[in-house]
Amino acid sequence: SAPFSFLSNMTYHFIRIIKHEFILNDTLNQTIIRANDQYLTAAAIHNLDEAVKFDMGAYTSSKDDTKVPVILRISKTQLYVSAQDEDQPVLLKEMPEIPKTITGSETNFLFFWETHGTKNYFISVAHPNLFIATKHDNWVCLAKGLPSITDFQILENQA
């Protein structure tokens, strides 16, 4: 399993929700859907209503950093994406409200959001060498890269 991040002793402060109700597609044009209660998967879907809609909340850190730490929440719920270890599915965990500050083990809820053109990457703050990733016939998990897919397209304002 991946070593726990040296960044875990930092404190992150919530700023605001920066994106509402967006959908994530991978480069195989698979869409992230919610499956089996606490897990996410990626599938080619015909009905976009089956896609998970996410909100993205931005945080600042006590260290000046060019990377943007974000939290991912299923829209209109109290369910947040939480990282586990490498090749383990990310979990949906319930919290009564968006955390105002995050530190220590709670950094499992944070991801550095990086963009390169239309490609979006979500790097675990708790495990900085691991990305949110999709894999053929598997769950959305944490992975270093291929054969998992780590780059996503953000589809905003889907009706």
Partner: antibody, heavy 122, light 107 residues
Amino acid sequence: EIQLVQSGAEVKKPGASVKVSCKASGYTFKYYGMNWVRQAPGQGLERMGWINTYTGESRYADDFKGRVTFTLDTSTSTAYMELSSLRSEDTAVYYCARDIYYFGSDYAMDYWGQGTTVTVSS
Amino acid sequence: DIQMTQSPSSLSASVGDRVTITCRASQDISNRLNWYQQKPGKAPKLLIYYASRLKPGVPSRFSGSGSGTDYTFTISSLQPEDIATYFCQQGNTPPYTFGQGTKLEIK
């Protein structure tokens, strides 16, 4: 084509057990949870509970706890519901139904088995 | 548990009529309300999810509306094949309870 095919009708005596199967096809079985819902003659729909087809974890409605067990055979994409200590009030049609979460938040049952009639009679 | 109260429990209408069924939740369910149709001797079939979204393949004469605790299901022009019992179900909070059903008959 997505299909849920259930086992045939059963007649049981009070105190006995019944095991109903539900074979799924047309989708990846482990991705979608499976519900069990029953309907007594002329009555409404009663959700008995749910099984996570990936972990095997089950959740049972309070009215059925201790009498019902959900199991899986992932190699054949089949879910099972076993109800024990049967009584006449358990006479009903039992359905399996697949989970879906629209937008990731609205829980619905989008595909249903054809139903299995269980008659409990002495 | 969230209680779902459906009304009426039965209704009789003529072909071509506009038919309305209501469902009230005991607390706010944030539009997470689904409607099912069950024809005699058949399994229920999902028609509408998220209060107003029509499942692909379902005829457009079926519609849903509402918010908060109060929701409505409408058939704009009743057809003979619509004879069935209709159930609402809240998809907000486990155990995802059903309404008691509305039996629809043709006059």
